[in-house]
Interface confidence: low
């Protein structure tokens, strides 16, 4: 479009942009303001992403995968801003984008490397498989491959099984740990190095409680201050394990300060909840209440699991009636 004799060629600048799957990002590019601006964004130097000249977009030859996903900051072009607004990035968008900007006096080439990360909130689950107990740290969708570390009583464990499956866009990771017969506390950390995002799961086993029929039991559940931040949204769930599966007794959502109780004999102290103490009471115990009780406090950055084992024994009266 311009006579090349007038061009000053400016060496390529390179920047790295890290985006999150399905979020919008900006690929930056600036130039020294000038008249008759031409902007071409290309991917891997071959696919046309966005073209602008003579004061408007020219998207006739735009690659179909970018349709309705790109735009420039039109009011700022005259100020030297050729940045590209890019909607809903996917892992397939990763790669090198080159922005060529021409004005009446020079051509500038800017390179932007786009890396895309995925980190759907992980979970820590407690499972019984036959006679074995397992803690499983898992993340449904993560990219690139995360760093998973386990600690037992704050000491790193080198054994680290990782079950990995790939889907079109990311990895799905399970890291199981056999904790059969252990009373230790466990911690699992999953780190996405690209997004600089870390999630921690912590599991604590409380001493077993022996109670008589028709008594009540108080089960403690207080978050560890290292992880817990009350101004962050979180959810607390109390559940009971019966024959290998958990049934939810009650849950609390911090965002709405809502408590939902599914078991009439379950009670929560509102005042304690306001002090971030999620201990619960179960009234009028019967023999079928024996089992494992799990308190799960979860947010985007952590899961804290506390497990109690309750043994309910027949009262003397019941025993003598039989």
């Amino acid at each position: 479009i311009f006579p090349l004799a007038f061009f000053i060629y400016v060496p390529m600048n390179e920047q790295i942009v890290i985006g999150r799957l399905d979020e919008d990002i900006i690929l930056p590019s600036s130039f020294e303001r000038g008249s008759e601006v031409v902007i071409h964004w290309k991917y891997q130097d071959s696919y046309k992403v966005h073209s602008y000249y003579k004061g408007s977009d020219h998207l006739e030859s735009q690659d179909p995968r970018y349709a309705n996903r790109t735009s420039l900051f039109y009011n700022e072009i005259q100020n030297g801003n050729a940045s590209l607004f890019f909607r809903r990035v996917s892992l397939l968008d990763e790669g090198i984008y080159t922005c060529y900007v021409g004005t009446a006096i020079q051509v500038i080439t800017n390179k932007v490397v786009l890396k895309v990360g995925v980190f759907l909130t992980p979970v820590m689950k407690y499972e019984k498989r036959n006679t074995n107990s397992f803690l499983i740290c898992s993340v449904l969708s993560v990219y690139p491959r995360p760093i998973i570390t386990w600690k037992m009583d704050n000491t790193p464990i080198s054994e680290n099984n990782m079950e990995e499956t790939g889907s079109l866009d990311s990895f799905s990771i399970n890291s199981p740990l056999n904790i059969t017969g252990s009373n230790s506390s466990y911690e699992c950390t999953i780190e996405n190095s690209l997004l600089k995002q870390t999630w921690t799961g912590r599991w604590t086993m409380k001493d077993g409680l022996h109670k008589m029929q028709s008594e009540h039991v108080s089960l403690s559940c207080q978050p560890v201050n290292d992880y817990f931040s009350p101004n962050q949204d979180f959810k607390v769930t109390w559940s009971r394990m019966k024959s290998g599966t958990f049934s939810v007794l009650a849950y609390y959502l911090s965002s709405s300060q809502n408590t939902i109780i599914n078991e009439s004999r379950f009670s929560w102290n509102k005042e304690l909840i306001n002090q971030s103490d999620f201990s619960m009471n179960l009234m009028d115990l019967n023999l079928s209440d024996s089992g494992e009780y799990l308190c799960n406090i979860s947010s985007d950055e952590y899961t804290l699991l506390t497990i109690h084992t309750v043994h309910v024994e027949p009262s003397q009266e019941t025993a003598s009636h039989n």
């Epitope: 790295i16 891997q44 071959s46 696919y47 397939l92 790669g95 090198i96 490397v113 990219y143 690139p144 491959r145 760093i147 790939g166 889907s167 079109l168 990895f171 190095s193």
Partner: antibody
Framework: QVQLQQSAAELARPGASVKMSCKAS????????MHWVKQRPGQGLEWIGY????????DYSQKFQGKSTLTTDKSSNTAYIQLTSLTSEDSAVYFC?????????WGQGTTLTVSS | DIVMTQSHKFMSTSVGDRVSITCKAS??????VAWYQQKPGQSPKLLLY???TRHTGVPDRFTGSGSGTDYTLTISSVQAEDLALYHC?????????FGGGTKLEIK
């Protein structure tokens, strides 16, 4: 389990072209990029480039641009590298490797000898 | 392109020794460094990625450290089967580049 099976050794004349293959099994082929790496006898590793089988796009090291072409056949889970205008400098072992950023599984390598 | 330099082409060690192999990048690669082990006549095997994370099945005598431009692979107690060529690689930006390799020899 993940396996990358590469084609047999090749002997070629200078100026000729050669196409080597890498058949993947044990995982979803379109999920991971496939990289190609060159190793001359007693030397280090050189990254040639990669191809994304899902989209078919490829990215090459400048040194190998024009020398190599990467392709895939999704129906047979196979990746290919074609090398053209062969010279003795192209004599090497060529590896395919499954990518994320790091290369977690490698083929056994295909030895290319260019000789008149 | 980012240049990865392994300053020692050869390193000699004894079984049971601790050995550290170093790798220097020509620019900051943000811990995006992988280490590979290659035994004679075999293809490379991934040991570590993101500078310090062990790949599945890699013995815990192999550890990695580093940030910015300087990275180290350490074998805490060398075994006879560790005799191999060790490559570092940056997986920060394409073109991905490898170091020249360090050959670990057993005395």
């Amino acid at each position: 389990q993940v396996q990358l099976q590469q084609s047999a050794a090749e002997l070629a004349r200078p100026g000729a072209s050669v196409k080597m293959s890498c058949k993947a099994s044990g995982y979803t082929f379109t999920t991971y990029t496939m990289h190609w790496v060159k190793q001359r006898p007693g030397q280090g590793l050189e990254w040639i480039g990669y191809i994304n089988p899902s989209r078919g796009y490829s990215d090459y090291s400048q040194k190998f641009q024009g020398k190599s072409t990467l392709t895939t056949d999704k129906s047979s889970n196979t990746a290919y590298i074609q090398l053209t205008s062969l010279t003795s400098e192209d004599s090497a072992v060529y590896f395919c490797a499954r990518g994320g950023y790091d290369f977690d599984y490698w083929g056994q390598g295909t030895t290319l000898t260019v000789s008149s | 392109d980012i240049v990865m330099t392994q300053s020692h082409k050869f390193m000699s060690t004894s079984v049971g020794d601790r050995v550290s192999i170093t790798c220097k990048a020509s620019q900051d690669v943000g811990t995006a460094v992988a280490w590979y082990q290659q035994k004679p006549g075999q293809s490379p095997k991934l040991l570590l990625y993101w500078a310090s994370t062990r790949h599945t099945g890699v013995p815990d005598r192999f550890t990695g450290s580093g940030s910015g431009t300087d990275y180290t692979l350490t074998i805490s107690s060398v075994q006879a089967e560790d005799l191999a060529l060790y490559h570092c690689q940056q997986h920060f930006i394409t073109p991905y580049t490898f170091g020249g390799g360090t050959k670990l020899e057993i005395k």
